[in-house]
């Protein structure tokens, strides 16, 4: 009598995640009576995938009608393949018994699953940095198979070269993850800049996935301060302005100090944006010179984005301006926040 053969013609089968996989198996004889079972893996820890004899295998269907006696085809189709289904599948013939006795196994078919990488997620530094500093951006993508993958970094369309990439795990796995860290040197012009992480994989058919991060989340552009005095007005008032320019983000608090005492505090809001994404702000004070005997030291103090305050001072020379009669008395208040020094911003 001819020896029973269990034939698995394909050594390997590759399937895209979500598709169905067909695993082929034929036997040379239906003798002796007994079931065919499919397992993933070999040895004592093997996993039962399909048993014609019994059990509920909702994702597995026989390719041919197993109830036809002359059917020697015990191929199966597994639906909705995921990376977790990867492995080597064995078609095994048993002889009926208690327990069933394993007679012969096929050589095995390795199922590999082509799984798309997840959309790359780019994350930037936890705290903002200023121009000329180097910041790190991390790009992560998961769940892809096979392991081969290409990752590139771009800043405003220009490819970056200073990055380090790891694909895990190093050994064989059902699916893989990639993590890449790019180092980017910031400039004052980077508020509108963007970094792009681009992932190319065999499953993407030449249409890479991209993840982006805006440098606006990572950069701080500290302001320039300039305090100037406008010419003396006819009513003995001097207009002093504090120009705060080219800063980002908008979060900024400006305090006027008169001889070291807080005169007024303002918060920047709803400022128009410069072309480069930075902001400008001008605040002004009106100083009634005739109300002062001595020179007035005005300080414009700016606290930007939680950083230590930056000061710019200016002295208004009272001696340079002739006093009017009765000018040594306090000037009448003409509005809130006005204590002989009048202010505004714009």
């Amino acid at each position: 009598e001819e020896e029973l053969q269990v034939i698995q013609p394909e050594k390997s089968v590759s399937v895209a995640a979500g598709d169905s996989a067909t695993l082929n198996c034929t036997v040379s004889s239906l003798i002796p009576v007994g079931p065919i079972q499919w397992f993933r893996g070999a040895g004592p820890g093997r996993e039962l995938i399909y048993n014609l004899k019994e059990g509920h295998f909702p994702r597995v269907t026989p390719v041919s009608d197993p109830t036809k006696r002359n059917n020697m085809d015990f191929s199966i189709r597994i639906s909705n393949i995921t990376p977790a289904d990867a492995g080597t599948y064995y078609c095994v013939k048993f002889r009926k018994g208690s327990p069933d006795v394993e007679l012969k196994s096929g050589a095995g078919t390795e199922l590999s699953v082509r799984a798309k990488p997840s959309a790359p997620v780019v994350s930037g530094p936890a705290v903002r940095a200023t121009a000329e500093h180097t910041v790190s951006f991390t790009c992560e993508s998961h769940g892809f198979s096979p392991r081969d993958i290409t990752l590139k970094w771009f800043k405003n369309g220009n490819e970056l070269s200073d990055f380090q990439t790891n694909v895990d795990p190093a050994g064989k796995s059902v699916s893989y993850s990639i993590r890449s860290t790019a180092r980017v040197v910031l400039t004052r012009r980077d508020v509108h800049s963007q970094v792009i992480c681009e992932v190319a994989h065999v499953t993407l058919q030449g249409d890479p996935l991209r993840g982006t991060a805006n440098l606006s989340e990572a950069i701080r552009v500290p302001p320039f301060l300039e305090v100037t005095q406008q010419s003396m007005r006819a009513d003995n008032q001097v207009n002093v302005t504090c120009q705060v320019t080219k800063f980002y983000p908008q979060r900024l608090q400006l305090t006027w100090l008169e001889n070291g005492n807080v005169s007024r505090t303002e918060m920047a809001s709803a400022l128009p944006e410069n072309k480069d994404g930075t902001y400008n702000w001008t605040s002004w004070l009106l100083v009634n010179v005739s109300a002062h005997r001595d020179d007035v030291k005005l300080t414009c103090q700016v606290e930007h984005d939680g950083q230590p305050a930056v000061n710019k001072s200016f002295s208004v020379k009272v001696s340079a301006h002739p006093k009017e009669q009765g000018s040594n008395t306090a000037a009448e208040n003409t509005g809130t926040n006005e204590r002989n020094i009048y202010g505004g911003s714009g």
Partner: antibody
């Protein structure tokens, strides 16, 4: 339609012989394990004999040496040659098809009555 | 030979009842157990194979369970046509053997 039709039953004297036939239609008989099962009047079912696809034959102890199971592929038929019949062989004899891979009975004939009596 | 013992031998029940018949093998038969239904003057009908698999065309009110030596047949809601004699059978090894039968009668 898959069908099994038995014939050849009847009245026979103890020690006599009878040949039962089972004509199969709707499937190829040689591709299946085939069986004979009997039921004495008012009693339960008793498996009698089987023939495998390779021609291997099996019998219950009480009929060994007296009964012979065979098949004729050209006629798609199964037979049971019964010799040295005894009164306790009196029964309805059913031809039964065994299932594909585990030999579970799936198709039964309508049966033929064998009466062994003097 | 493997002995098959059914219980009860007879059972009275009403239409709509749920009934369970048990079958015990004298040794481990894996799950190579079948159940048959027979009505008077008729050939047996195959209901269940490998302990729990329904033959095609058999209504789902019939269910089987068990493995090793202890098995059950359950009919979930009896109908008039279900009153018959039920047999279990082991087919793990020759000689195949049947239980003595359980006669299900209308109460």
């Amino acid at each position: 339609e898959v069908q099994l039709v038995e014939s050849g039953g009847g009245l026979v004297q103890p020690g006599g012989s009878l040949r039962l036939s089972c004509a199969a239609s709707g499937f190829t008989l040689s591709s299946y394990d085939m069986h004979w099962v009997r039921q004495a009047p008012g009693k339960g079912l008793e498996w009698v004999s089987a023939i495998g696809t390779a021609g291997d034959t099996y019998y219950t102890g009480s009929v060994k040496g007296r009964f012979t199971i065979s098949r004729e592929n050209a006629k798609n038929s199964l037979y049971l040659q019964m010799n040295s019949l005894r009164a306790d062989d009196t029964a309805v004899y059913y031809c039964v098809r065994g299932g594909v891979w585990d030999d579970a009975f799936d198709i039964w004939g309508q049966g033929t009555m064998v009466t062994v009596s003097s | 030979d493997i002995q098959m013992t059914q219980s009860p031998s007879s059972l009275s029940a009403s239409v709509g009842d749920r009934v369970t018949i048990t079958c015990r093998a004298s040794q481990d038969i894996n799950n190579y157990l079948a159940w048959f239904q027979q009505k008077p003057g008729k050939a047996p009908k195959s209901l269940i194979y490998t302990a729990s698999s329904l033959h095609s065309g058999v209504p789902s009110k019939f269910s089987g369970s068990g493995s090793g030596t202890d098995f059950t047949l359950t009919i979930s809601s009896l109908q008039p046509e279900d009153f018959a004699t039920y047999y279990c059978q082991q087919y793990v090894s020759y000689p195949y053997t049947f239980g003595q039968g359980t006669k299900l009668e209308i109460k």
